[in-house]
């Protein structure tokens, strides 16, 4: 089949870092400089990605691969293949239209990045609050006040779950 | 890619319970919160709650604060919320909805709704 | 809880520009993300953080953003972007809560 394929049309011929010229009777020519073809067979390069501004390259562009980019310091990636770079802020901020502002009351956030979430409402789950929110901490819940009897050992804090949201795509 | 799969259409007696599911697929489930929103037959869309897959944590609107729980099993990526006390109000389709990473929070995906129908 | 304002429906000429508006205190602190929902299906984002595009949105598609009011705007609408229009912000307490709904005709 790949021969029959390669007879039909001479581009499948043609590997990645080079793009199969129409203007030179199809023979395959190399991607020019700041371009690339990552799959055989392309009849064109694809332009570099170039990681201007806030971002700053993290893989050079090859003639078989694009560039990747991230964030300069101060900044983090968002989106696929880090297509935004957005700031950062302190723990217990959140960026907003007016830039970092600190959480609101009964809300915190624990990272330099995301948003501020509200404390976490123990007595919907018929427990007490052990250990109060801050703007950079969730509350710690702890026993009901019914289970707390004099001479109870005080319940050790969780350790904070990972705040989602980093993890690819 | 990306895609959220909800369990099927529900029909219910006022009073009774009802527990829809949200399949994830394409990411990493426990790397996102999972919103739930419902909209009744002609109406807006309405907040419910959401659920942070990882640790399990919850926030809920106050409207139905005490008749809805938003579980997780992070084993089959899924997501479900369970909404008690039925009334014929609560007829809706109800969506599941990833959101998005920022500082400004959106949805995406959304699931593709389940009608709950609450009669008698 | 705080509420997000939306004219309940707007007509815009084939071909011509329209712009929705979300009004609410809590856009003077967040800005609104919309979405774009038809009969029978489920919303689906068309901007977001300012004014990104997810990928297979078209560019006619921008949000702005002044004072407590966000916009989206559609520059030459088409036919299909007839659908029902919600903004959605954060409130202060962490909370989310959906625009009231525009209804766009493409006349």
């Known amino acids: 089949f790949e021969r029959t394929r390669s007879l039909q049309d001479p581009c499948s011929n043609c590997p990645a870092g080079t793009f199969c010229d129409n203007n030179r009777n199809q023979i395959c020519s190399p991607c020019p400089p700041n371009s690339f073809s990552s799959a055989g067979g392309q009849r064109t390069c694809d332009i570099c990605r170039q990681c201007k501004g806030v971002f700053r390259t993290r893989k050079e562009c090859s003639s078989t691969s694009n560039a990747e980019c991230d964030c300069t310091p101060g900044f983090h990636c968002l989106g696929a293949g880090c297509s935004m770079c957005e700031q950062d802020c302190k723990q217990g901020q959140e960026l907003t239209k007016k830039g970092c502002k600190d959480c609101c009351f009964g809300t915190f956030n624990d990272q330099k990045r995301g948003i501020c979430r509200p404390w976490t409402n123990c007595s919907l789950d018929g427990k007490s609050v052990l250990v109060n929110g801050t703007k950079e901490r969730d509350v710690v819940c702890g026993p009901s006040p019914a289970d707390l009897s004099p001479g109870a050992s005080s319940v050790t804090p969780p350790a904070p779950a990972r705040e989602p949201g980093h993890s690819p795509q | 890619q990306v895609q959220l799969v909800q369990s099927g259409a529900e029909v219910k007696k006022p009073g009774a319970s009802v527990k829809v599911s949200c399949k994830a697929s394409g990411y990493t489930f426990t790397g996102y919160y999972m919103h739930w929103v419902r909209q009744a037959p002609g109406q807006g869309l309405e907040w419910m709650g959401w659920i942070n897959p990882n640790s399990g944590g919850t926030n809920y609107a106050q409207k139905f604060q005490g008749r809805v729980t938003m579980t997780r099993d992070t084993s089959i990526s899924t997501a479900y919320m369970e909404l008690s006390r039925l009334r014929s109000d609560d007829t809706a389709v109800y969506y599941c909805?990833?959101?998005?990473?920022?500082?400004?929070?959106?949805?995406?995906?959304w699931g593709q709704g389940t009608l709950v129908t609450v009669s008698s | 809880s705080s509420e997000l304002t939306q004219d309940p429906a707007v007509s815009v000429a084939l071909g011509q520009t329209v712009r929705i508006t979300c009004q609410g205190d809590?856009?003077?602190?967040?800005?609104a993300s919309w979405y774009q929902q038809k009969p029978g299906q489920a919303p689906v984002l068309v901007i977001y953080n300012k004014n990104n595009r997810p990928s297979g949105i078209p560019d006619r598609f921008s949000g702005s953003s002044s004072g407590n009011t966000d916009s989206l705007t559609i520059t030459g609408a088409q036919a299909e972007d007839e659908a029902d229009y919600y903004c959605n912000s954060r409130d202060s307490s962490g909370n989310y809560v959906f625009g009231t709904g525009t209804k766009l005709t493409v006349l």
């Open positions: 909805a990833r959101e998005g990473v920022g500082a400004t929070s959106w949805f995406d995906p």
């Open positions: 809590s856009l003077r602190r967040y800005h």
